[in-house]
Interface confidence: low
């Protein structure tokens, strides 16, 4: 005598949106407010997440899925399913222990969000500096001298100190 | 806003199989799973399966099993349902409704004739 | 299965009625109850789930109540869009099972 799925476990039965309630000889009971199950046949409801203080609700849970949250402005998101927030800064700032500094000398971050990071070396590609950097964009590499057609104005190079990884202390 | 969009109005001959499309749109798919549920004329709602369309696992009515399939195409955003071995009791509207707390949005329903 | 017995299966009012339909459960379902209205030709529309909770654009008229077996939708002022065929549902347990339906016509 083979049982079916369902004999062998009646909680397969129950949908996404309920419980297989053992209370209640494994009866489907739906899942209580601010509760959730996204796939049939589970044995509890997950709680719905809240998106409290800095966080901000995206998607409102429902009884077959949690809610999902973003940030509030002026911060970001971090981790998998947004399980943190950043602070976000300035464009030419970026986020340290002590809150957002301005980038170095020879370094640019043109994002709320992430790190300072250096200049192009335009030389090392073998071409000039057509637009100098900024704390905010990068610079701007153009042909180098040799490859200027005869009557065009060249573009001076930086300086060595506005060479990437230069910056003062 | 939530709109489910069925396939049209089908005539199919005793023993034949019909396929009804329900395309959705205006919400995430995958995050509410899918039922079916028919109408005979004049008759009172009857609930044929469901699907989970994120893992795309079928539940059928017992009245049902063996005739029926319910499957989704997630990158389409659409689910199906196929009733074989049709007989002229199978003359209904079909419905496709998204399931939350309830059935709570439904597609405008497809008309399946079957006469020989 | 549960069955979902409604009465009753007709009933004549007329606008600005008090409209009161009854649902009984064959077993306690608990409110794992639900109300849709039909109108001819039409796909159901969701009143009220968990026995009685409006779904999203349903007007306060129509208001739900009861739990275990017995199951009751108000509608407290009919209005015109009223007139229509309402049925009961049970999601306590799989398979959900559907009301015979209580249609709503003008006296």
């Known amino acids: 005598f083979e049982r079916t799925r369902s004999l062998q476990d009646p909680c397969s039965n129950c949908p996404a949106g309920t419980f297989c309630d053992n209370n209640r000889n494994q009866i489907c009971s739906p899942c209580p407010p601010n509760s959730f199950s996204s796939a049939g046949g589970q044995r509890t409801c997950d709680i719905c997440r809240q998106c409290k203080g800095v966080f901000r609700t995206r998607k409102e849970c429902s009884s077959t899925s949690n809610a999902e949250c973003d940030c509030t402005p002026g911060f970001h998101c971090l981790g998998a399913g947004c399980s943190m927030c950043e602070q976000d800064c300035k464009q030419g700032q970026e986020l340290t222990k002590k809150g957002c500094k301005d980038c170095c000398f020879g370094t640019f971050n043109d994002q709320k969000r992430g790190i300072c990071r250096p200049w192009t070396n335009c030389s090392l590609d073998g071409k000039s500096v057509l637009v100098n950097g900024t704390k905010e964009r990068d610079v701007v590499c153009g042909p180098s001298p040799a490859d200027l057609s005869p009557g065009a104005s060249s573009v001076t190079p930086p300086a060595p100190a506005r060479e990437p990884g230069h910056s003062p202390q | 806003q939530v709109q489910l969009v069925q396939s049209g109005a089908e005539v199919k001959k005793p023993g034949a199989s019909v396929k009804v499309s329900c395309k959705a749109s205006g919400y995430t798919f995958t995050d509410y799973s899918m039922h079916w549920v028919r109408q005979a004329p004049g008759q009172r709602l009857e609930w044929m399966g469901w699907i989970n369309t994120e893992t795309g696992e079928p539940t059928y009515a017992d009245d049902f099993k063996g005739r029926v399939t319910i499957t989704r195409d997630t990158s389409a955003s659409t689910a199906y349902m196929e009733l074989s071995s049709l007989r002229s009791e199978d003359t209904a509207v079909y419905y496709c409704?998204?399931?939350?707390?309830?059935?709570?949005?439904w597609g405008q329903g497809t008309l399946v004739t079957v006469s020989s | 299965d549960i069955q979902m017995t409604q009465s009753p299966s007709t009933l004549s009012a007329s606008v600005g009625d008090r409209v009161t339909i009854t649902c009984k459960a064959s077993q306690d379902v608990s409110s794992a109850v639900a109300w849709y209205q039909q109108k001819s030709g039409k796909a159901p529309k969701l009143l009220i789930y968990w026995a009685s909770i409006r779904h999203t654009g349903v007007p306060s008229r129509f208001s739900g109540s009861g739990s275990g077996t017995e199951f009751t939708l108000t509608i407290s002022s009919l209005q015109p869009d009223d007139f229509a065929t309402y049925y009961c549902?049970?999601?306590?347990?799989?398979?959900?099972?559907f009301g015979g339906g209580t249609k709503v016509e003008i006296k």
């Open positions: 549902q049970q999601r306590y347990t799989t398979p959900p099972t």
């Open positions: 409704a998204r399931y939350d707390y309830a059935m709570d949005y």
